[in-house]
Amino acid sequence: ECVTQLLKDTCFEGGDITTVFTPSAKYCQVVCTYHPRCLLFTFTAESPSEDPTRWFTCVLKDSVTETLPRVNRTAAISGYSFKQCSHQISACNKDIYVDLDMKGINYNSSVAKSAQECQERCTDDVHCHFFTYATRQFPSLEHRNICLLKHTQTGTPTRITKLDKVVSGFSLKSCALSNLACIRDIFPNTVFADSNIDSVMAPDAFVCGRICTHHPGCLFFTFFSQEWPKESQRNLCLLKTSESGLPSTRIKKSKALSGFSLQSCRHSIPVFCHSSFYHDTDFLGEELDIVAAKSHEACQKLCTNAVRCQFFTYTPAQASCNEGKGKCYLKLSSNGSPTKILHGRGGISGYTLRLCKMDNECTTKIKPRIVGGTASVRGEWPWQVTLHTTSPTQRHLCGGSIIGNQWILTAAHCFYGVESPKILRVYSGILNQSEIKEDTSFFGVQEIIIHDQYKMAESGYDIALLKLETTVNYTDSQRPICLPSKGDRNVIYTDCWVTGWGYRKLRDKIQNTLQKAKIPLVTNEECQKRYRGHKITHKMICAGYREGGKDACKGDSGGPLSCKHNEVWHLVGITSWGEGCAQRERPGVYTNVVEYVDWILEKTQAV
């Protein structure tokens, strides 16, 4: 069961896996959640009754029964990992710790104006896990305003001590705030021969890459496929690093694949969730349980529901045996990966889906698109919402996109003349406007946040957030779309769609059924040529056919320009303005969402 509260002055006895140092009990709980085996923890706060060398220790624990005996101890704070919980989990930690020095390898020292600047530097440095900043009140003159970037093997400090007039904090890479490039390519027939920090077994290069992504020290990887000539190294995933942050040695070698950590794009692609099944593949590991199951899907469900299960192998039933049920072997290991992978034995293997909640919901695969036609089908664009105004009468006002369980992203120009959020209603999971009746459930709007530099659509900053009064429960028909990664600025999107209930021609009416149109992106240079009287800035993005014919129109405003990249949909643009609708050589102009990611995160993650 899910227990979120912390137990003060309580220590769990036994079950120790390892000890790390964390600045707070709250962060200890996060570290426990992300550790492959940790189910419980005990954190020691600073206290005069405790030996200072034990302050800030976070002891990660495991237990077959999922609990341990409790003992009273002053300054001890204990709790359970969030593995047992169903809610979204994030490693993002924006807290700044005053008068704490988090120890690690100090590999970079520079002057910074503020702790925030130091944190930004850490976030944009490939090696940095955390930092310590000496404030201008620091006693030693030559150390004032010094920003120390630090890293460790585990990503957590090697020790934490009290030190006046310094502040410490963590890199915000896991908050999607890094400007580092996001390199998604996997290079076939390539070995990176740089330093190995660890090696694990993986069924394919994609899982190897995802393991690299959530390993604190891994910057790139090499994977030896099952056709690799050396049998003892088949399915071996080498996690690697280098001083420069890039591979220094690339060697051509067939049956090997190499790639990069996806740390800088992890909020917009799945990195924890290994959802595939591996046929004719057996995963070896410590056996947790053997249960009968009807299918490999049922076996995966059993593994997901067993909190200690990390991966499984299912052996299908022999004909007419055991009521058609096969054997489901639930397994675990010290690092969450199989200890060995064997092929040709007829098993079907896979991983727990429990870790999927550590990924952004927006990365979940949605149902396949319907190709051709202009009318959408239910569940095709589950992030699309219809925003209604109730004054003077109820009508569709604008489109919008779900980007979080309490947040809609839309256009600022939609709110011209809207005096209060009270007159707004957000309907999600809607295909036809005719579905909306008196008793149709909707989300009230608590707050409208318009970009403070917005004046008019044509001059840019046409972006607004709606904070909902209640949270959206994600389902197949209503779920978020991913924001583009700042590290993805150079990606060329080729599969982009505009959707909405807007007019189909300039003089028309709101459509009943959600319409869709596939539209190519146009370079800003090309777009500028088409709009000589306007300034097309880098904060805008254009899309349209040269010959016209397909475009967004009145009523589509605020809705998404959705682009699919690497199987994940990204909110690349917000429908903003254009000259007429679908006119020849007049592309539609959209708010370029990637340029506003910092603004969105600042507003949605504000405490």
């Epitope: 070995v191 990176f192 740089d194 330093s195 920090i197 090696s199 050396k230 003892s232 080498l238 060697i251």
Partner: nanobody, 126 residues
Framework: QVQLVESGGGSVQAGGSLRLSCTAS????????MAWYRQAPGNECELVST???????YYADSVKGRFTISQDNSKNTMYLQMNSLRAEDTAVYYC????????????????????WGQGTLVTVSS
Amino acid sequence: QVQLVESGGGSVQAGGSLRLSCTASEFTFDDSDMAWYRQAPGNECELVSTITSDGGTYYADSVKGRFTISQDNSKNTMYLQMNSLRAEDTAVYYCAADQWGSAEGDCTSSYPGGYWGQGTLVTVSS
């Protein structure tokens, strides 16, 4: 028990030459990727040269044109011919088999299926 034994190390004047050998026992070269690594005092282990099972070779930029890797499968031996030696080539040289990169910058620890020799010291005096 796989064993890799290096020989041929020693002291030499800058500009001189040395030829290192690595002989393997309980192990065949034919289907292995062999390499020479080196570690200078206080430095990390670095890859010098590799020769892959399909005959491909690789050299670190710092040794290109001066060092040559080769192997004799019939003798189960790999060689590193080092010419125009420089003071900065001073290091312990390690022979490695199926070892793609060092572990934690150290020329001795391996992952499954990878092997290291015990090393031979090369000292180049200027």
